[in-house]
Interface confidence: low
């Protein structure tokens, strides 16, 4: 889940309506209960007759899916509404980067140990805005209104819980989930911020105010300078409201425009591979603002040559996914200041 | 902290309409669907009826057909049950509870309807 | 419709003993691995509460002296040692098929 190990995540937005991996019963590896076929069932209101053109992913399958802008991905469980006839499904690999899982938090001492607040109107990136401001490196949201502050120190001494146990709505937020009673959702702060220095091998940047919409007016900077002599970048989520907000990527060096992408021009859906070592991406938002906005992984590449069977910035063959064997959550050089 | 908040207390007489209310916070409202209980004075629990949230259908148990009407506001978070014609056998504790996998997990506090001319 | 049968209609029992209410469907609650049987606790004045669910489940934050058992046609629940603050009236309840329905109740005082 962390910020710095992307490949290990198929889920790029926060309730997990880019899901779109194949785990077709309600728990992890054969457990939980399966799922009915989206194109088998007759009685219920999502179907693959009711996404004809699949933006929800659904088709002649039983993934696990979220098509209805539900808190995490779910499926059908039986033919009619009565009893239990949906469920929500447990994907360990469907959480954003970012996010570094449920933590129980038994409050003496706190799971994470620095300033806490409480808000009727909390969502995640409240919290993280609220953290981020206080300096801290980690934000928890619990129970669906609190918010604390704390250090990966914390997280040392940490108990992870099971996922699900953070379950409770976000009281800003109908599609978010901020936690649970006694669990904490721990995120790493740089998650949606303004501005970044990223050093780190292979990342992801989100777009500010990420998972919640991009708000009016944003005018944010992130330096990307990984080891390398080029740079691939990967768009897994790209939502602008309009052609007025805009994501522009520049040669760090000499400043020169290199791609420029907005709401009526998105990226291209696979690989953008950049023969630059360091990149600036500016995004500005004019005064309506308001979208999902955007978030994309980075990873620094050794060869600068670009492929020559291709035109840059087309598709091309993803990467293996990145080894997430030595993720772990001690400090990593490299990491973001908080913004 | 999950909450079912009811309308007060109702006094009506015969023949009057009424709507009362439940209003959701604390969850995903839409997620979980509503139903309605009926507890007459000193007798069990009766179930009268539930809507399917996202459609807004309402099912009805057969004894509440054609007496009740359940409906939804998702915008306010808020189930309705309704009478257009009270009559004094509908004096009772009216309940809502929100359905899960756990069975009727959330219950609201009851609003009580005294019908009497 | 299925009709819940429960019994005993009124239970006595001492502080520290144990108690148990049975309550039978008039057909299959079971499918597919589950029990669709729920029990509740009410108390005078107040909504009922959720204290077992699927048959056996124990509802959080409900103390385990509480315990249901059971599939198919007929089902218990048992408190194992009766404690004061357990005095109530006890509803089984079934969410196999609609209409949902309720056992008629169980009331537990002490002896």
């Known amino acids: 889940g962390s910020l710095h190990s992307p490949g290990l995540s198929e889920c790029f937005q926060v309730n997990g309506a880019d899901y779109r991996g194949h785990q077709n019963r309600t728990g992890p590896r054969g457990a939980g209960r399966p799922c009915l076929f989206w194109d088998q069932t007759q009685q219920h209101s999502y179907s693959s007759a009711s996404d004809p053109h699949g933006r929800w992913g659904l088709g002649a399958h039983n993934f696990c899916r979220n098509p209805d802008g539900d808190v995490q991905p779910w499926c059908y469980v039986a033919e009619t509404e009565e009893g239990i006839y949906w469920r929500y499904c447990d994907i360990p690999s469907c959480h954003m980067p970012g996010y570094l899982g449920c933590f129980v938090d038994s409050g003496a001492p706190p799971a994470l140990s620095g300033p806490s607040g409480t808000s009727t109107k909390l969502t995640v990136q409240v919290c993280l805005r609220f953290c981020r401001m206080k300096g801290y490196q980690l934000a928890g949201v619990e129970a669906g209104y609190a918010c604390f502050c704390g250090s990966e120190s914390d997280l040392a001494r940490g108990r992870l819980a099971p996922a699900t146990d953070c379950d409770q709505i976000c009281f800003g937020h109908p599609g978010q989930l901020c936690g649970g009673d006694g669990r904490l959702g721990v995120y790493e702060v740089s998650v949606g911020s303004c501005q970044g220095n990223w050093t780190a091998p292979q990342g992801v940047i989100y777009s500010p105010d990420f998972p919640d919409e991009y708000g009016p007016d944003r005018n944010c900077s992130w330096a990307l300078g990984p080891p390398g002599a080029a740079l691939e970048l990967t768009f897994r989520l790209f939502e602008l409201a309009d052609p007025r907000d805009r994501l522009e990527l520049r040669d760090a060096a000499s400043g020169s425009l290199l791609r420029a992408f907005d709401g009526a021009r998105p990226p291209p859906s696979g690989p953008l591979r950049l023969g630059t070592a360091a990149l600036l991406l500016t995004f500005r938002s004019d005064a309506r603002g308001h979208a999902q906005g955007f978030a994309l992984t980075y990873r620094g590449l050794q060869d600068a040559a670009e492929d020559p069977e291709a035109p840059e910035g087309s598709a091309q063959t993803p990467a293996a996914p990145l080894d997430g064997a030595n993720v772990s959550c001690s400090p990593r050089p490299g990491a973001p200041p908080a913004a | 902290e999950v909450q079912l908040v009811q309308s007060g207390a109702e006094v009506k007489k015969p023949g009057e309409s009424l709507k009362i209310s439940c209003k959701g916070s604390?969850?995903?409202?839409?997620?979980?669907?509503m139903h309605w209980v009926r507890q007459m004075p000193g007798k069990g629990l009766e179930w009268m009826g539930w809507?399917?949230?996202?459609?807004?259908?309402?099912t009805y148990a057969d004894d509440f057909k054609g007496q009740v009407t359940i409906s939804l506001d998702k915008s306010i978070s808020t189930a309705y049950l309704q009478w257009s014609s009270l009559k004094a056998s509908d004096t009772a504790m009216y309940y809502c509870?929100?359905?899960?996998?756990?069975?009727?997990?959330?219950w609201g506090q009851g609003t009580t309807v005294t019908v009497s001319s | 419709d299925i009709v819940m049968t429960q019994s005993p209609d009124s239970l006595a029992v001492s502080l520290g003993e144990r108690a148990t209410i049975n309550c039978r469907a008039s057909?299959?609650?079971?499918?597919?691995?589950?029990?669709?049987m729920h029990w509740y606790q009410q108390k005078p004045g107040q909504p009922p509460k959720l204290l077992i669910y699927?048959?056996?489940n124990l509802e959080s934050g409900v103390p385990d002296r509480f315990s249901g058992s059971g599939s198919g046609t007929d089902f218990t629940l048992t408190i194992s040692s009766l404690q004061a603050e357990d005095v109530a009236v006890y509803y089984c309840?079934?969410?196999?098929?609609?209409?949902?329905?309720f056992g008629g109740g169980t009331k537990v005082e002490i002896k």
């Open positions: 509870a929100r359905n899960w996998d756990k069975g009727f997990d959330y």
């Open positions: 604390g969850y995903s409202f839409t997620s979980y669907p």
């Open positions: 809507i399917k949230m996202y459609s807004g259908v309402p």
């Open positions: 057909k299959s609650v079971s499918t597919s691995g589950y029990s669709y």
């Open positions: 699927l048959a056996s």
């Open positions: 309840q079934h969410i196999r098929e609609l209409p949902y329905t």
